[in-house]
Structures are given as structure tokens and as C-alpha cells.
């Protein structure tokens, strides 16, 4: 009679994480008598997965009634597969004895686990940056298998090309992680912009995962200032306005100075929003000209988002009122510790 063969018909089986894997195994003879065992891996470090004779294997069930005397099908089903279950499984026939001895092994079935990548997480720079700067964004996704994966970056609808991607580990593993860093150039119109990391994988059936970062959390757009003198409202009163334009974020404090002395300080509250997401704000100062003997230097000083103050001045010619006169000059305090800030 022909010697018993252990047949594992599938060289490989691929299963999605969470599903069950069926590993097929048949023998060609009932002789010699003895149990079947399933192992993952080969050699002395192999891991017992199922023993027909004894033991408790809660995730493993036999496909056919392996207890019947004439049964020659020893296929098993492993439930709730995770990436940690990946490996080569061997169906091994033992000869009955004290102890049982290994008689013949199947060729092995490689089980690969298809695991979905985690939702990509996109993170930007630690501190706000200003337009015209190039900043880095990172995207991470974990726990996927197999290793092949595609990652793309977009700024709004436009695909980015300046990025570097690594998949770890380099060698064989039960699951993998991807890490990518993209360089993004900020513009003054980027408050509403988004940076998107898109991950495509065989497990996602053509429906990629996306992670998003809003550039509103990254960008700081400094304001421009304009000081203008309005027509005289009353005989001795002049209205001077300071227009603060195109700034983001909203956090802004404005101080009026008359000849270097603080007149009023206010915080931007009722701002108007521009289409690009930046803000405009206007403050006005009513100056009683009759209270001044000499020309008045009016300064609108703005501190935006905790940055050093930027200011713009207007020379109010007392002798010339009620005409609109005066020249605009601008000043800025660079705010290092050594400076005198108003």
C-alpha cells in the first residue's frame, strides 16, 4: 500500500483581519494510526495551533468530523484572524506511541492577513508660521498588511510632489506603519486651505482613507495698517481712523497714542471676515484739536497674536484744521527684550 501523504493544497491563503481562515489538509491513508497536529512555523520553535488528540483551542474548529474513524480531512478554521496570525501553517501526521512521533508533514500553507491601515493622522508645525514660508506636515498610519501601500498629499485639490515616505519595518512583519513628511508653502490666502494625506491599500477596495490638517491652525497673516483723517465732525473735533487689514488669527489689540502717550487701548471684537478667511477691523479716535497747541502725532499701534507691535502714525496739523492734512508715516516695534515698547 502506498505510503501516507499529507496534502495541503493551498500554498497560500489571504484573509482579512477579523475574518476566519480555512486551512485545508487531507491525508491519503488511514495508516499509520495517530493524531494530526497543526503548527505555525517549522523547527524547534514552532507553535502548536491545534492538536486532534488533546488540548483547548478556542479559536480553532475542524471543518469535517475529524473524530470519525474513516475521516481523512483535517482542515481547520481559525476565527477572528489578526495580523499576528500571519505565518506558514503545517499540517503534521503523528504515529501513535508513547510518546507519539512525527511521521509526515504537509508542505505548508502561508497565511497572509489583510489588515486595514488606521485612519491617517496629519500633524503640522509646533508654532505658527507666516506666509511665504515652507513648513512640514507629517502623516502616519499603522497596522496594515500587506506592506504595499500608496500615500498621496494634497493641498486643497492640488497634489503635492515634495514629500518623503517610509514604510516600516523594512523586512517581514505581521503589520506595517507608514510615515510621510510633506513640505507645504504657505500663502496669504491659505487660512481656509487644507492639507490632506490620502492612503490607498488593497483592504480599502478603492476607497482611500484621508487625514486632514487645516492651515488655519498653522498660519499667521500679519496685518497692514492705514491711518486716515476723516472730515471734521464738529468745530474742534477730528476723526482719525486706523484700518487694520488682512490679518489672521483674530487675536489683536490696538492702542492709540497721542504724541507718544497712550490714549486708548482696545481689543478687536466686531471684525469683518474677508473671503480668504483673513479679518479686517477699523478703530477710530476723536481728537479734540482745541486741546492741543501744537501739531499732534497720532499713532495706531497694533499687537497681533502676541507678536511685537506694528504701528502707523499720522501727523495732525493743528494750525491747518479743519482741512485734511498730514503725512502718513509708519513705525514698528520689533519687541525684543532690550527695546522700549510703548
Amino acid at each position: 500500500e502506498e505510503e501516507l501523504q499529507v496534502i495541503q493544497p493551498d500554498k497560500s491563503v489571504s484573509v482579512a483581519a477579523g475574518e476566519s481562515a480555512i486551512l485545508h489538509c487531507t491525508v491519503t491513508s488511514l495508516i499509520p494510526v495517530g493524531p494530526i497536529q497543526w503548527f505555525r512555523g517549522a523547527g524547534p520553535a514552532r507553535e502548536l495551533i491545534y492538536n486532534q488528540k488533546e488540548g483547548h483551542f478556542p479559536r480553532v474548529t475542524t471543518v469535517s468530523e475529524s473524530t470519525k474513524r474513516e475521516n481523512m480531512d483535517f482542515s481547520i478554521s481559525i476565527s477572528n484572524i489578526t495580523p499576528a496570525d500571519a505565518g506558514t501553517y503545517y499540517c503534521v501526521k503523528f504515529r501513535k506511541g508513547s510518546p507519539d512521533t512525527e511521521f509526515k508533514s504537509g508542505a505548508g500553507t502561508e497565511l497572509s492577513v489583510r489588515a486595514k491601515p488606521s485612519a491617517p493622522v496629519v500633524s503640522g508645525p509646533a508654532a505658527r508660521a507666516t506666509p511665504q514660508h515652507t513648513v512640514s506636515f507629517t502623516c502616519e498610519s499603522h497596522g496594515f498588511s500587506p506592506r504595499d501601500i500608496t500615500l498621496k498629499w494634497f493641498k486643497n485639490g492640488n497634489e503635492l510632489s515634495d514629500f518623503q515616505t517610509n514604510v516600516d519595518p523594512v523586512g517581514e512583519s505581521v503589520s506595517y506603519s507608514i510615515h510621510s513628511t510633506a513640505k507645504v508653502v504657505l500663502t496669504r490666502e491659505d487660512v481656509h486651505s487644507q492639507v490632506i494625506c490620502e492612503v490607498a491599500h488593497v483592504t480599502l477596495q478603492g476607497d482611500p482613507l484621508r487625514g486632514t490638517a487645516n492651515l488655519s491652525e498653522t498660519i499667521r497673516v500679519p496685518p497692514t495698517l492705514e491711518v486716515t483723517q476723516q472730515p471734521v465732525r464738529a468745530e474742534n473735533q477730528v476723526n482719525v481712523t486706523c484700518q487694520v487689514r488682512k490679518f489672521y488669527p483674530q487675536r489683536l489689540q490696538l492702542t492709540w497714542l497721542e504724541n507718544g502717550n497712550v490714549s486708548r487701548t482696545e481689543t478687536a471684537s466686531t471684525v469683518t471676515e474677508n473671503k480668504d478667511g483673513t479679518y479686517n477691523w477699523m478703530s477710530w479716535l476723536l481728537v479734540n484739536v482745541s486741546a492741543h497747541r501744537d501739531d499732534v502725532k497720532l499713532t495706531c499701534q497694533v499687537e497681533h497674536d502676541g507678536q511685537p507691535a506694528v504701528s502707523k502714525s499720522h501727523d495732525l496739523k493743528v494750525s491747518a484744521h479743519p482741512k485734511e492734512q498730514g503725512s502718513n508715516t509708519a513705525a514698528e516695534n520689533t519687541g525684543s527684550n532690550e527695546r522700549n515698547i510703548y
Partner: antibody
Framework: EVQLQESGAELVRPGASVKLSCKAL????????IHWVKETPVYGLEWIGD????????ANNQKFKGKATLTADKSSNTAYMELSSLTSEDSAVYYC????????????WGQGTSVTVSS | DIQMTQSSSSFSGSLGDRLTINCKAS??????VAWYQQKPGNAPRLLIS???SLETGVLSRFSGSGSGKDYTLSINGLQAEDVATYYC?????????FGGGTKLEIK
């Protein structure tokens, strides 16, 4: 006292690279940008680019793209500029400077590093 | 790139003179103008930022003015120690750009 200490003069061969350093003292390194400026008799002062050690953001003059690479090491409060594929055109004095982040003037300057490219 | 044009590359003045150095930008730079003084063999020194704000330690005989595209540095009462090259610089749009410099000499 705010100080920017630049590395010493360099004499380098054409085709080689050089890495200039700028150590920041007397202020919080990550709160300000470090800018680099080139000075030559022919072109005067030219802005090369800047790096913000806090955000990691950089801005560059396209003229120096591929020529100058800016980096910063927060642990040592030091900024670096590497100049590659050097030619005689790169012979100059290079300054590192400091500026508040975003549309502020360069308020402190290093003493300058002289780079001479010669065979 | 924004061009910064200093109309005169050199200027000769007498002690006590009031002199002005003009700088014209090729487009509006929203007051983001700085003036630097550079003495031979030294690094430039910031005198004025934001068009008119004097840096700490800069003497009040220096002043700045202007808006839009046109900016001016004034020295009121020229002193011997003012002999230097003066540069304007815009920092509104990258690349930041400098004027060609005005070399100031005493007659």
C-alpha cells in the same frame, strides 16, 4: 545680551561644500527666525533665506535654491547654512541675523563669516 | 522680486548738514522697510524698522518716513561718525531685498 556667534573664516576648493554655523545667545532661540545674508562687492547685500527653529518653517531666495541649505539645532541653539558645489561666485562674507517671526526687520547680526573659494 | 532702488550710490555732505537718502520699491511694501548702517569691516546695524521706528540706542538725529513705494532716511546734523554705507531693505515679500546702498562721505 543678544549675540549671534558665527564660525570662522573658510578657504575652500571649487566644487567642495562648506557648513557655516551661527550660535544664538541671550534670547529664546525658538521664538525668532534666523536669516542669512550674503555680501559681495558686486551685488551688495543679498538675502539667502531664513529658518524658524520653532516651527521648522523656511523661506528661500530662489537664486540660492540648490546652493544653500538651512538647518537649525534646537538643542544647541545653533543655526547652520551649508553651501554646496562652491565656485568663485560664492566667495563672500555671510551673515546670520535674527528677526521676529513674520514681517519684521533683522535686528541683530552676527560678525560675518568670510568664505573664499580658490584652488 | 521687489526691486529697491536707492537713487544715489554716494553722497558727500558737510558736518552739520541735513541730508536725506531716498529708496523706491517696485511695488507697495506696506511700510515694511528697514534702514541699516554699515561701517567698513563691520556687519550692518539696524537703525530704523517699519519705516519710522528708531531702534534702541540709535540717535534721534536719524529719522525715517514714507509709505507705499517711497521711503526716506533723514540725518539731521551730519556727524563724522555717520560716515558709512546706508541700505534700505523691504521685508514684505520674499525674497527680502536690499537697495544698492548709499555711501556717505564728509566733504
Amino acid at each position: 545680551e543678544v549675540q549671534l556667534q558665527e564660525s570662522g573664516a573658510e578657504l575652500v576648493r571649487p566644487g567642495a561644500s562648506v557648513k557655516l554655523s551661527c550660535k544664538a545667545l541671550g534670547y529664546t532661540f525658538t521664538d525668532y527666525e534666523i536669516h542669512w545674508v550674503k555680501e559681495t562687492p558686486v551685488y551688495g547685500l543679498e538675502w539667502i533665506g531664513d529658518i524658524h527653529p520653532g516651527s521648522g518653517g523656511t523661506a528661500n531666495n530662489q537664486k540660492f535654491k540648490g546652493k544653500a541649505t538651512l538647518t537649525a539645532d534646537k538643542s544647541s541653539n545653533t543655526a547652520y547654512m551649508e553651501l554646496s558645489s562652491l565656485t568663485s561666485e560664492d566667495s563672500a562674507v555671510y551673515y546670520c541675523t535674527r528677526a521676529v517671526s513674520g514681517y519684521y526687520a533683522m535686528d541683530y547680526w552676527g560678525q560675518g563669516t568670510s568664505v573664499t573659494v580658490s584652488s | 522680486d521687489i526691486q529697491m532702488t536707492q537713487s544715489s550710490s554716494s553722497f558727500s555732505g558737510s558736518l552739520g548738514d541735513r541730508l536725506t537718502i531716498n529708496c523706491k520699491a517696485s511695488e507697495d511694501i506696506y511700510d515694511r522697510v528697514a534702514w541699516y548702517q554699515q561701517k567698513p569691516g563691520n556687519a550692518p546695524r539696524l537703525l530704523i524698522s517699519g519705516t519710522a521706528s528708531l531702534e534702541t540706542g540709535v540717535l534721534s538725529r536719524f529719522s525715517g518716513s514714507g509709505s507705499g513705494k517711497d521711503y526716506t532716511l533723514s540725518i539731521n546734523g551730519l556727524q563724522a561718525e555717520d560716515v558709512a554705507t546706508y541700505y534700505c531693505q523691504q521685508y514684505w515679500t520674499t525674497p527680502w531685498t536690499f537697495g544698492g546702498g548709499t555711501k556717505l562721505e564728509i566733504k
